[in-house]
Each structure stands twice: as structure tokens, then as C-alpha cells.
């Protein structure tokens, strides 16, 4: 025998109090799959959360965070404070990155500057709290007498003007 509740579509529930009739989900509730015996309560985006997507009869509300915060956890279950670039969030608030580290985002941790010498390269642009160093050519490429980084222009034959 087929379960009569299996015919109830998403957005409804199988109402045992009414001979297993498919009843619409009440306000502020939803069912995202068919055959449900209850509807789930919609998530409410309160306080530091704001509504990204309203609840419907077939899908839950989705929240994100108010400006100055960013989402953490599955389905944005938490909002964490933003910091400025060049800082990281510690257990005592936002702190500047230590010398030799950087953070180019408003979230996450300070990361060490790239060590150019590990790749046999030189530092082209120094790092800051907000930006990583930029590695350039290897020191050998910059030493006197080394071949030029750009190839020389081709020689023109005498007596010929450029086209």
C-alpha cells in the first residue's frame, strides 16, 4: 500500500489531524521535500544577521551578516567581526600584522611574506602589512655583465630608413 503522505508536495505537510490531507505549510514555516509530516520553522535573521533570501513555503530563509561582519560556519551560522587590511582578528580584537607578515583581506590571519630567496629571486617590491613582497629576477640577472633582460633591437642595414 502506498503511503498517502508521499503525494504531498514540497510546501505542504501531511496533516494527520485531517485524514492525512496535504495542508499548506503555515506562515513562517516551510517543507523543502515532499511527503513531510511537519513543516520546519523558518530561520529568522535577527541582530547582526540580515536576510539574504526570504523564507518561502518550500525553502528556508538564508542569512548573511550586517556590514562590518562576515559569515562563518555552515549556512552562515555565525557572524565574525571584520578587521582592516593589514590586521587580523585576535581574541582581544583587531591587531596589526607583525613585521614580516601581511593580510590583504578584511578577514583571516596575517601570513608571512614570500621568501623570494627560496626561489633564487630578489625582492622587487618590499612587503607591507597589507601586501606581500613582489619577487623579481634572480640576483644573477641583475649583476653587471649579465645578459640584458630584454633582447637588443635588431640592427638595421645602413642607408635604409624605417618603413
Amino acid at each position: 500500500l502506498q503511503d498517502p503522505c508521499s503525494n504531498c508536495p514540497a510546501g505542504t505537510f501531511c496533516d494527520n489531524n485531517r485524514n492525512q490531507i496535504c495542508s499548506p505549510c503555515p506562515p513562517n514555516s516551510f517543507s523543502s521535500a515532499g511527503g513531510q509530516r511537519t513543516c520546519d520553522i523558518c530561520r529568522q535573521c535577527k541582530g547582526v544577521f540580515r536576510t539574504r533570501k526570504e523564507c518561502s513555503s518550500t525553502s528556508n530563509a538564508e542569512c548573511d551578516c550586517t556590514p562590518g561582519f562576515h559569515c562563518l560556519g555552515a549556512g552562515c551560522s555565525m557572524c565574525e567581526q571584520d578587521c582592516k587590511q593589514g590586521q587580523e582578528l585576535t581574541k582581544k580584537g583587531c591587531k596589526d600584522c607583525c613585521f614580516g607578515t601581511f593580510n590583504d583581506q578584511k578577514r583571516g590571519i596575517c601570513r608571512p611574506w614570500t621568501n623570494c630567496s627560496l626561489d633564487g629571486k630578489s625582492v622587487l617590491v618590499n612587503g607591507t602589512k597589507e601586501r606581500d613582497v613582489v619577487c623579481g629576477p634572480s640576483p644573477a640577472d641583475l649583476s653587471p655583465g649579465a645578459s640584458s633582460v630584454t633582447p637588443p633591437a635588431p640592427a638595421r642595414e645602413p642607408g635604409h630608413s624605417p618603413q
Epitope: E88, L89, K91, K92, I109, C110
Partner: nanobody
Framework: EVQLLESGGGLVQPGGSLRLSCAAS????????MSWFRQPPETGLKWVSS????????YYADSVKGRFTISRDNSKNTLYLQMNSLRAEDTAVYYC?????????????????WGQGTTVTVSS
């Protein structure tokens, strides 16, 4: 799969006590520092307390020092937060978290796994 499951939240009167638990699975529990965080209704996530892998070192936010006690039972893979002298401002969703490194007062939030949270409401 690494999982954290909190329990023990509920409604309590000001001055009352609650004990939160966090059951861990999927990793070698004793190898990692663990933390409690909370998110009050109107503000962002705040660190509450941390404990190192052995349970020897504990750290607390100033707002809970002397009232909350973090502990762990490595034989049961469980983290605890004993909360005494509760105040209205302790109302929040409480999350346990696995830290990627040793947690100290001003270390960054080096958290790689969060629980789903348990709600604590302090009201008369």
C-alpha cells in the same frame, strides 16, 4: 568526518548555573586545543575561553573570568563549559570549536571546525 556536537543550553534565571558539553569525533581530541565562542543576539562572534590539548592551560575572556570554567575529558572526547553566576548579557548561542594551534589570550582565531551551537538564555 570531524564533528562537534554541543548540548546543555537552556533557559536559566540570573545568578543560575549551566554546564555545556561538546562531544568531539573524527580526530585525535587530545592533540588539539579547544575553544568556546558565543554569539549574542545583537552582536558578532566573541571568544569565551580556550584550553590546551592536555587541559593544563586555560584562558578566559575578561567578561567571564571567575564565573566560567573550561575543562575537558580526553578519555570521553568531551569539552565542557561550567557557567556560574549567569547574567542577562551571557545570553547567546554558544559554539565549541577545534583550534588548529595552541589557544592563548591573544592568539588569532585559528579555528578549523565549529559545532552547530547551543542556545543559552538568561532571563527572569
Amino acid at each position: 568526518e570531524v564533528q562537534l556536537l554541543e548540548s546543555g543550553g537552556g533557559l536559566v534565571q540570573p545568578g543560575g548555573s549551566l554546564r555545556l558539553s561538546c562531544a568531539a569525533s573524527g580526530f585525535t581530541f587530545s592533540n588539539y586545543a579547544m575553544s568556546w565562542f558565543r554569539q549574542p543576539p545583537e552582536t558578532g562572534l566573541k571568544w569565551v575561553s580556550s584550553i590546551d590539548g592536555s587541559g593544563g592551560d586555560t584562558y578566559y575572556a575578561d567578561s567571564v573570568k571567575g564565573r566560567f570554567t573550561i575543562s575537558r575529558d580526553n578519555s570521553k572526547n568531551t569539552l565542557y563549559l561550567q557557567m556560574n553566576s549567569l547574567r542577562a548579557e551571557d545570553t547567546a548561542v554558544y559554539y565549541c570549536a577545534k583550534e588548529g594551534s595552541h589557544g592563548t589570550d591573544d592568539s588569532h582565531y585559528d579555528v578549523d571546525v565549529w559545532g552547530q551551537g547551543t542556545t543559552v538564555t538568561v532571563s527572569s
